[in-house]
Amino acid sequence: TLNSVLNSNAIKNLPPPLGGAAGHPGSAVSAAPGILYPGGNKYQTIDNYQPYPCAEDEECGTDEYCASPTRGGDAGVQICLACRKRRKRCMRHAMCCPGNYCKNGICVSSDQNHFRGEIEETITESFGNDHSTLDGYSRRTTLSSKMYHTKGQEGSVCLRSSDCASGLCCARHFWSKICKPVLKEGQVCTKHRRKGSHGLEIFQRCYCGEGLSCRIQKDHHQASNSSRLHTCQRH
């Protein structure tokens, strides 16, 4: 049975005023807007989750990534740090500011072609290897030029929202991130109260579409804070 308690899901790329979070172990979680699956969290363990400001990149803002604030510092203590600009050192794509990606340990500009649903196959920039993105590019185009130029469709694995087609965002889905639809008017959204507090969420919803914001549904004003239903509404 579908559960009517609509209270999980978060998204990394929330425009301001939608930063922050919610989500509790054992709460219902949803993968499709408005559709919930009870007890989704029973498959999750969080033994190694530390209650610090962030555990993963998607818990930070668009221009941030999650890491230990000190070099060689305690791996458990992680906070959201400002993204690295072009030509700065990096270890993964999320460390680089939007419009850039991590290649051979350096943030470089990502021209439109570089991203699609299965990003890493093209961007073979693993640091111990000599393959560069351009090598990957020349190899891939002959094999699958159609896929190379298309951005990720709904259900495709992604690293950030720019990997997804128009109308989709890149959001957490259990232990991966996939392209999901940006929310439409009337759809349930997640209003985050405090940045970096949604570590327990196993799904993320996208943000509300253009011209919409995530607000308490009018007839839910009387409800207790924890059960207030937020939906995407016109400004």
Epitope: A32, E154, W175, I202
Partner: antibody
Framework: QVQLVESGGGLVQPGGSLRLSCAAS????????MTWVRQAPGKGLEWVSG????????YYADSVKGRFTISRDNSKNTLYLQMNSLRAEDTAVYYC????????WGQGTLVTVSS | DIVLTQSPATLSLSPGERATLSCRAS???????LAWYQQKPGQAPRLLIY???NRATGVPARFSGSGSGTDFTLTISSLEPEDFAVYYC?????????FGQGTKVEIK
């Protein structure tokens, strides 16, 4: 190119333990969630466990919860599956695969639980 | 748990023929979070389709996926000798991730 190589399988007695490893190459390991799937001889595929890119989030099938532990060492580009209290029904080929729909798979490693 | 039922269990066809494999979910998936895999004896599975209809890298155009809700289809437009194998569908909407029991495509 993307490569996943499992190791650590073998024959073990019921109640015993085994640790499987999966060495990854050809992609930025910590960008991707990883998955373990198993296949009993002559049977279909069964999801076992998943872990997020940083290792902060782990998930298990009910059949292995409390007995198996998934982990990863991103500095070594390696995924692990620690299997304790093994049972005869855990006998299977264990595959590691990348992401939630498995776009790349290892060749598998056979785990046989028998007395 | 979402149960995926594949039909038929076995499909006997000749090279050049069209193969249509069905995967039915016990609950509406609402989103296209369904993948198809091909597995040959002694080998690991290989991803063919993800997101219900997106062909994975390097997969020939004769393979196509379609469907939504509870009914999904994998179509092989013209069977090649190397296509005779077992095919599995998998949903990744909710946990536990589940696979269909498989459809074996064999040479007639």
């Amino acid at each position: 190119q993307v490569q996943l190589v499992e190791s650590g399988g073998g024959l073990v007695q019921p109640g015993g333990s085994l640790r499987l490893s999966c060495a990854a190459s050809g992609f930025t390991f910590n960008n991707y969630g990883m998955t373990w799937v198993r296949q009993a001889p002559g049977k279909g595929l069964e999801w076992v466990s998943g872990i997020s890119g940083s290792g902060s989030y782990t998930y298990y099938a009910d059949s292995v919860k409390g007995r198996f532990t998934i982990s990863r060492d991103n500095s070594k580009n390696t995924l692990y599956l620690q299997m304790n209290s093994l049972r005869a029904e855990d006998t299977a080929v264990y595959y590691c695969a990348r992401t939630i729909y498995m776009d790349y798979w290892g060749q598998g490693t056979l785990v046989t639980v028998s007395s | 748990d979402i149960v995926l039922t594949q039909s038929p269990a076995t499909l006997s066809l000749s090279p050049g023929e069209r193969a249509t494999l069905s995967c039915r979910a016990s609950q509406n998936l609402f989103s296209p979070y369904l993948a198809w895999y091909q597995q040959k004896p002694g080998q690991a599975p290989r991803l063919l389709i993800y997101g219900a209809s997106n062909r994975a890298t390097g997969v020939p155009a004769r393979f196509s996926g379609s469907g939504s809700g509870t009914d999904f289809t994998l179509t092989i437009s013209s069977l090649e000798p190397e296509d005779f194998a077992v095919y599995y569908c998998q949903q990744y909407l909710t946990l536990p991730l589940t696979f269909g029991q498989g459809t074996k495509v064999e040479i007639k």
